[in-house]
């Protein structure tokens, strides 16, 4: 209708990075920009994804290098994290959120794909990381090894081998394990502190240089107390599980201090593993009963989990695996490891800014049934798995509904702001829920809409539209882009109109009648009034139309509803040659060229396209005759 197709601004980018996957218009004190997501962008050797800022009129795009943002205190894996897969602008302060739903971090032997988002302020400066699903690793441990280095330990090289082998089993790194070593005899010394080394390689290297310090006495109580009061303090981390491993070959010369030392360790929640090396006793034919009792006393309860004894120093190698396994059984204590909560949540798969924070879709949460999390300045709200049961019953829990594939919100005059989320795989047909979130981690689900067709991906795209701009939502549009019709993936967009408290189904939007795949409804954007009739409008993308070149459809709002026949269909081929997947993302909230008209930004594979609005001239014809 009034979108100019003759002089679009086609902003080129990398196809391999999928520049254009997401687009958002951006305003910084009058300067207009396009923010473009490129979720497969490379940073160095890693395919992190990134976000570009592109000037609207002319000039080249600049990478924001958000892919370089690192989270401290986690062993992160940024490769393939898909930064820019979702973008959400906050019109209040013109900041935006760029999400990396496949951002993962190492936890023990696993990588947890919790996802994370970067908040970028209005002048394109990174301001904060938003990662509500990120939880401390179960391997967030401070381990202090307390080594008996008294004269009776022989040969020392066996102790060293044991130390190196056990260290190789530890998941050492930021947000995981830190290791410190103290050696004792008559005195106690720090061999190295908890925060001296940040990798297995470095710790092993340091351990290989520890020499036996000797001593005629074995002050085990003092060694343990030194570890508790000093070693765990120097470089120890708040909230880290404290683990102590005591290795000794004889009764202590300060055993009357053990009671108090162990009490203090208990108070500090130090889990103690104790290893009795019986070499000295066996070489001399001494009964080790008193010694073994002492080591059992040192070890945390129950003994069968925390106490080890070996025949001699050489046999230490035989307990490496068992000791490692027992320490890491602390990881998932009483936890059903076959079930995932937020570990694979992929938070930020979708995002939506609300008044008090941001909603983040987490499609992988709760065994890929999905969830919606909320991050606010006051904290985060993570609804419990049970809070979804009303609409996502237990018997379908293995289906992977992907709730949070898209998130938005609606405003009704009765209920105020209500959140909306799509679960396109629910029971194979898809579902959309409208809900409010509570700080006690529960939800109230007000309404649910279900898809009609298996595999249609109903709910993979949702947009709320305030047609008349009165602050109350009039229409909710739900996309089912894989809707199969007439032998093709045609796609469908369902229209729901707000009647009092409920959204009532009111037909579907009409697409063109071609006989190719289209995926109409892959993207749906509520845009500000394009045709200057004072009603806000809607643009729908069909990125597979025209043999994957893509097309968009413009639908006009009218009197609290939406006209279901498109007023304009714009195909990629009209705009430029070589465009592909045009319409995969759409945003239209700003006047980009200062002509007083709202312009459109549309994403394509390797391109972002700006379509300028043209003024609409209203001609009122009137006839009058003379003479009358």
């Amino acid at each position: 209708f009034n979108m100019d197709t003759r002089k679009p601004r086609v902003i080129p980018g990398s196809r391999t990075a999928f520049f254009g996957y997401t687009v958002q218009q951006h305003d910084i004190s009058g300067n207009k920009w396009l923010v473009v997501g490129a979720p497969l962008e490379t940073n160095g050797y890693q395919k992190t994804g990134d976000v570009y800022k592109c000037p609207v009129i002319h000039g080249n795009c600049t990478k924001l290098n958000l892919g370089r943002v690192t989270l401290s205190n986690v062993s992160e894996r940024k490769d393939n994290m898909r930064l820019g897969l979702s973008l959400a602008t906050n019109p209040k302060d013109n900041s935006f959120l760029a999400c990396s739903p496949l951002w993962s971090h190492e936890c023990g032997s696993s990588y947890y794909t919790t996802g994370m988002c970067s908040r970028v302020n209005s002048n394109f400066r990174f301001s904060k990381t938003v990662a509500p699903a990120l939880q401390r690793c179960q391997t967030y441990m401070d381990i202090v090894i307390v080594l008996d280095g008294s004269n009776s330990i022989y040969p020392w090289v066996e102790v060293q081998h044991f130390l190196i082998n056990i260290l190789k089993k530890f998941y050492i790194g930021p947000g995981q394990i830190q290791v410190g070593v103290v050696q004792y005899g008559e005195d106690v010394v720090h061999e190295f502190h908890l925060n001296d080394y940040r990798s297995v390689k470095d710790v092993v290297e340091a351990a290989s240089h520890i020499e036996q310090r000797g001593g005629t006495e074995t002050r085990t109580a003092f060694g343990i107390e030194f570890a508790r009061s000093e070693a765990f303090q120097k470089g120890g981390r708040k909230g880290a599980k404290k683990v102590m491993i005591v290795i000794t070959d004889g009764e202590s010369h300060d055993s009357p201090d053990l009671e108090k030392v162990i009490q203090q360790s208990e108070r500090d929640n130090v889990t103690r593993y104790a290893v009795a090396v019986l070499g000295y006793y066996n070489r001399r034919g001494i009964n080790p009963e008193t010694f073994l009792n002492e080591i059992k006393y040192i070890a945390s309860d129950p003994d069968d989990k925390h106490f080890f004894n070996v025949t001699d120093e050489a046999a230490l190698k035989d307990i490496v695996d068992a000791l490692g396994d027992r320490i890491f059984s602390l990881e998932g204590t009483n936890k059903n490891e076959t079930s995932f909560g937020l570990e694979m949540s992929q938070t930020g798969f979708s995002s939506h800014v609300v008044e008090d924070g941001v909603l983040l879709g987490a499609v992988g949460a709760y065994d890929w049934n999905g969830a919606v999390l909320k991050e606010t300045s006051a904290g985060k709200v993570i609804p419990l798995r049970e809070s979804y049961l009303k609409e996502f019953p237990e018997e379908l829990k293995n289906h992977g509904a992907y709730l949070g594939y898209t998130v938005t919100s609606v405003v009704s005059s009765r209920q105020g702001r209500v959140y909306v989320a799509g679960a396109p795989r629910f029971n194979h047909t898809g579902k959309v829920i409208l809900f409010t979130m509570h700080n006690n981690r529960s939800l109230t689900i007000h309404q649910a809409m279900r898809g009609q067709q298996i595999g249609s991906y109903f709910g993979s795209e949702i947009t709320s539209v305030d047609i008349d701009g009165d602050g109350v939502t009039d229409v909710l549009l739900v996309g089912a882009p894989m809707y199969f019709n007439e032998g093709r993936e045609r796609g469908k967009v369902y229209v729901y109109e707000l009647r009092q408290n409920l959204f009532v189904y009111n037909g579907t939007l009409k697409d063109s009648h071609s006989y190719q795949n289209a995926r109409f409804g892959s993207s749906i954007a509520s845009v500000r009034d394009l045709n200057q009739d004072s009603y806000n409008d809607v643009v729908v993308g069909a990125p597979l139309e025209d043999n994957h070149a893509g097309a968009i459809y413009i639908f006009h709002g009218f009197r609290g509803s939406i006209l279901k026949t498109p007023k304009q269909r714009i195909t990629a081929s009209e705009l430029a040659t070589g465009l592909q997947y045009f319409g995969c993302s759409i945003h239209g909230q700003l006047d980009l060229n200062e002509d007083g008209l709202i312009d459109l930004a549309v994403g394509a594979l390797g391109n972002a396209v700006i379509l300028w609005s043209r003024p609409v001239v209203q001609i009122n014809a009137s006839l009058h005759f003379e003479p009358s």
Epitope: E251, H253, P256, E259, K260, I262, N293, Y297
Partner: antibody, heavy 120, light 109 residues
Framework: EVQLVESGGGLVQPGGSLRLSCAAS????????IHWVRQAPGKGLEWVAS????????YYADSVKGRFTISADTSKNTAYLQMNSLRAEDTAVYYC?????????????WGQGTLVTVSS | DIQMTQSPSSLSASVGDRVTITCRAS??????VAWYQQKPGKAPKLLIY???SLYSGVPSRFSGSRSGTDFTLTISSLQPEDFATYYC???????????FGQGTKVEIK
């Protein structure tokens, strides 16, 4: 030769204070524990308190807890028993004794004792 | 706290007699039990440690044994210099709390 010598005993009024010393020689205080044991006239042995001079951990009998304080000065190789709020029932001969690993946690050397009399 | 109940509180015996003194612990304890001899006006002297080990310089007629919570000091052939008071002592494991028995006075018959 291992020796323990107590001093500081004497006559004191109820409610008064006294500080006993136990000077050790022939061994290092840091490698052992010192215990104070008392014996009221005509009565048996009663354990009073102990200290590890290395770690400074202390233990007390319930009858003296809060009134007596055991301490050690390793530079002087001497242990002390500070006795406050003395009562008539604290009247006894006070012995210090060595307690260590090499005697399998038995009191192998004792001082000659010092008499403390609490009387008005 | 562990109590050590010593019996008898006194006994009369003749030179050459075999004398047995028993200490019963109120609960199961380690073998860290010692026996002392004290003569009037003198400090106690260590005889037995670890329930049954003879301290150096102590005559071999003195011996100690353990049976469950019962600890026994035996003088196989009483000598004139053995007339004294004998105390058992128990060390609480892993602390330096100690407890004495009430004492057994061995007198000449």
């Amino acid at each position: 030769e291992v020796q323990l010598v107590e001093s500081g005993g004497g006559l004191v009024q109820p409610g008064g204070s006294l500080r006993l010393s136990c000077a050790a020689s022939g061994f290092n205080l840091t490698s052992s524990y010192i215990h104070w044991v008392r014996q009221a006239p005509g009565k048996g042995l009663e354990w009073v308190a102990s200290i590890s001079s290395y770690s400074s951990y202390t233990y007390y009998a319930d009858s003296v807890k809060g009134r007596f304080t055991i301490s050690a000065d390793t530079s002087k190789n001497t242990a002390y028993l500070q006795m406050n709020s003395l009562r008539a029932e604290d009247t006894a001969v006070y012995y210090c004794a060595r307690y260590w690993y090499y005697s399998a946690w038995a009191l192998d050397y004792w001082g000659q004792g010092t008499l403390v009399t609490v009387s008005s | 706290d562990i109590q050590m109940t010593q019996s008898p509180s006194s006994l009369s015996a003749s030179v050459g007699d075999r004398v047995t003194i028993t200490c019963r612990a109120s609960q199961s304890v380690s073998s860290a039990v010692a026996w002392y001899q004290q003569k009037p006006g003198k400090a106690p002297k260590l005889l037995i440690y670890s329930a049954s080990s003879l301290y150096s310089g102590v005559p071999s007629r003195f011996s100690g044994s353990r049976s469950g919570t019962d600890f026994t000091l035996t003088i196989s052939s009483l000598q004139p210099e053995d007339f004294a008071t004998y105390y058992c002592q128990q060390s609480a494991p892993y602390s330096s709390l100690i407890t004495f028995g009430q004492g057994t006075k061995v007198e000449i018959k």
